[in-house]
Interface confidence: medium
Amino acid sequence: MAHAGRTGYDNREIVMKYIHYKLSQRGYEWDAGDVGAAPPGAAPAPGIFSSQPGHTPHPAASRDPVARTSPLQTPAAPGAAAGPALSPVPPVVHLTLRQAGDDFSRRYRRDFAEMSSQLHLTPFTARGRFATVVEELFRDGVNWGRIVAFFEFGGVMCVESVNREMSPLVDNIALWMTEYLNRHLHTWIQDNGGWDAFVELYGPSMRPLFD
Amino acid sequence: MAKQPSDVSSECDREGRQLQPAERPPQLRPGAPTSLQTEPQGNPEGNHGGEGDSCPHGSPQGPLAPPASPGPFATRSPLFIFMRRSSLLSRSSSGYFSFDTDRSPAPMSCDKSTQTPSPPCQAFNHYLSAMASMRQAEPADMRPEIWIAQELRRIGDEFNAYYARRVFLNNYQAAEDHPRMVILRLLRYIVRLVWRMH
């Protein structure tokens, strides 16, 4: 498995591929826009939330949207040009997160159906809703199960946005997820073995010594 | 939610015993620096609360990240390419949940900055507050997002406990069946740890 060193993997890549997978499950192809995010520890880019509700999706080209945005480099925010280099994310991390997310959504499908009736998305409420939910979710601690819940919630918001013809929100949600991971979850993840540890816990129970 | 053996806002150890704040498991400390909108204001003691919270017996892994100063989100011009692929609709057998609310053609714009909301917006806002107060198990003023978050926390903790147990059982079983495999596994962890430290 790739060695992430002390800096860890690129959270933006993890988020982008996860959202792409969740949308593709529902029959949508997503070509990510410039969903840049500062590397972990970097100063946030200036600016305020702009939902840009006027944007509409247009037909996809025949290429793989993830391939188009690969290698999904994270643009450094202003003042963060010397940010730490991030390791490329090994495929097993994406795969394990997908499988954990699918297992999670299968187990708790009814809970999510119940929650969905309470989630009233508009371009003007999306950011506040996301912020409030995520803040409360991790208010008293972090664990891998909550991190999977975080990813599934983000995926749900993206699917709901597209379903409700608010697809421009998807790039925003991906950005918020990435920035939350970078600012608030990155240190916990690193302190707890990084995404490699997640793979150990949630991936196949036995693997070769070095993969 | 059916009543739990201990109060819903209590914390539990692996046997479901109520924990006092002093003996809180070190893996789950209060005051996660999670604000997206405001500057950190210390570490308020967070309860484990919510209508759905029970006592998951798997403990989270490790300490919390130190507070980080949250700033506003930067939003760049989004570029979208979406394509409906009907062939994929029946492909997934994962039981992925769906939102079965009505598919409104265009989102209703209810901008809070306008002094007098339009009648549709008034109705929409009334609906939101009605939905928030409909649930019998929470205080009438609980916002839907808070309830959603507490449900996510509940099921996230339950999911975490399931995998924590699964890993324990796998390792236990491996120790019985393949002692050499366990030694190799341990060696692998050590190698990774040393590797990370360089």
């Epitope: 499908r109 159906a113 | 029970s54 006592c55 997934s92 039981g95 406990a161 399931y162």
Partner: antibody, heavy 118, light 113 residues
């Protein structure tokens, strides 16, 4: 083979509490959620709630919020439901049922007939 | 809560006949993510617990005779028993398995003439 064993009957006085049991065998107890269902004569079936035997996490019908407490004892592979402040309305048959793959009840206990009477 | 409405409440049939019973839900039970309808049918004979017949609206549980067929989508569902046998006399319940709280219909009682 999978079996869910429940006591046949319980007789309790109004105002008291009762703890109904459901002993599972023939499968890994912690791998499947256990649900509880109430059936009163002529009233059909009512879902009470479920418990994840692995974590002890529960999800219940709000109607039973102040009535039912679901617990498990993993060492004996037994699920319990405690019913409190009993009234005649609680007189019913209570079933435990295993939820297969989070989608349907594939095995049911024989049910415990609870009679609340002074 | 999702309300499940079954009709008729009782049916009297002759052995060998074909019988259909209806179940309507107050909201759609179709999961658009996997195109499954989360509706389950159970059969309950006197003095016994319910027994699983059909799940996902139309998938027959193993061991259930093929004379039992489930159909429908969204909010309207049907259980059909072709060539009714004496052992089919029971109450049939449909159940919302889409959303919490899980809810059951009031049942359709199948009786022999």
């Amino acid at each position: 083979q999978v079996q869910l064993q429940q006591p046949g009957a319980e007789l309790v006085k109004p105002g008291a509490s009762v703890k109904l049991s459901c002993k599972a065998s023939g499968y890994t107890f912690t791998s499947y959620w256990m649900h509880w269902v109430k059936q009163r004569p002529g009233r059909g079936l009512e879902w009470i709630g479920r418990i994840d035997p692995n974590s002890g996490g529960t999800k219940s019908n709000e109607k039973f919020n102040n009535k039912a407490t679901l617990t498990v004892d993993k060492s004996s592979s037994t699920a319990y439901m405690q019913l409190s402040s009993l009234t005649s309305e609680d007189s019913a048959v209570y079933y435990c049922a295993r939820w297969w793959d989070y989608d349907y009840f594939d095995y049911w206990g024989q049910g415990t007939t609870l009679t609340v009477s002074s | 809560d999702i309300v499940m409405t079954q009709s008729p409440s009782s049916l009297t049939v002759t052995a060998g006949e074909k019988v259909t019973m209806s179940c309507k839900s107050s909201q759609s039970l179709l999961n658009s993510g996997n195109q499954k309808n989360y509706l389950t049918w159970y059969q309950q004979k006197p003095g016994q617990p319910p027994k699983l017949l059909i799940y996902w609206a139309s998938t027959r549980e193993s061991g259930v005779p093929d004379r039992f067929t489930g159909s429908g989508s969204g909010t309207d569902f049907t259980l059909t028993i072709s060539n009714v046998q004496a052992e089919d006399l029971a109450v049939y319940y449909c159940q919302n398995d889409y959303n919490y709280p899980l809810t059951f219909g009031a049942g359709t009682k199948l009786e022999l003439k």
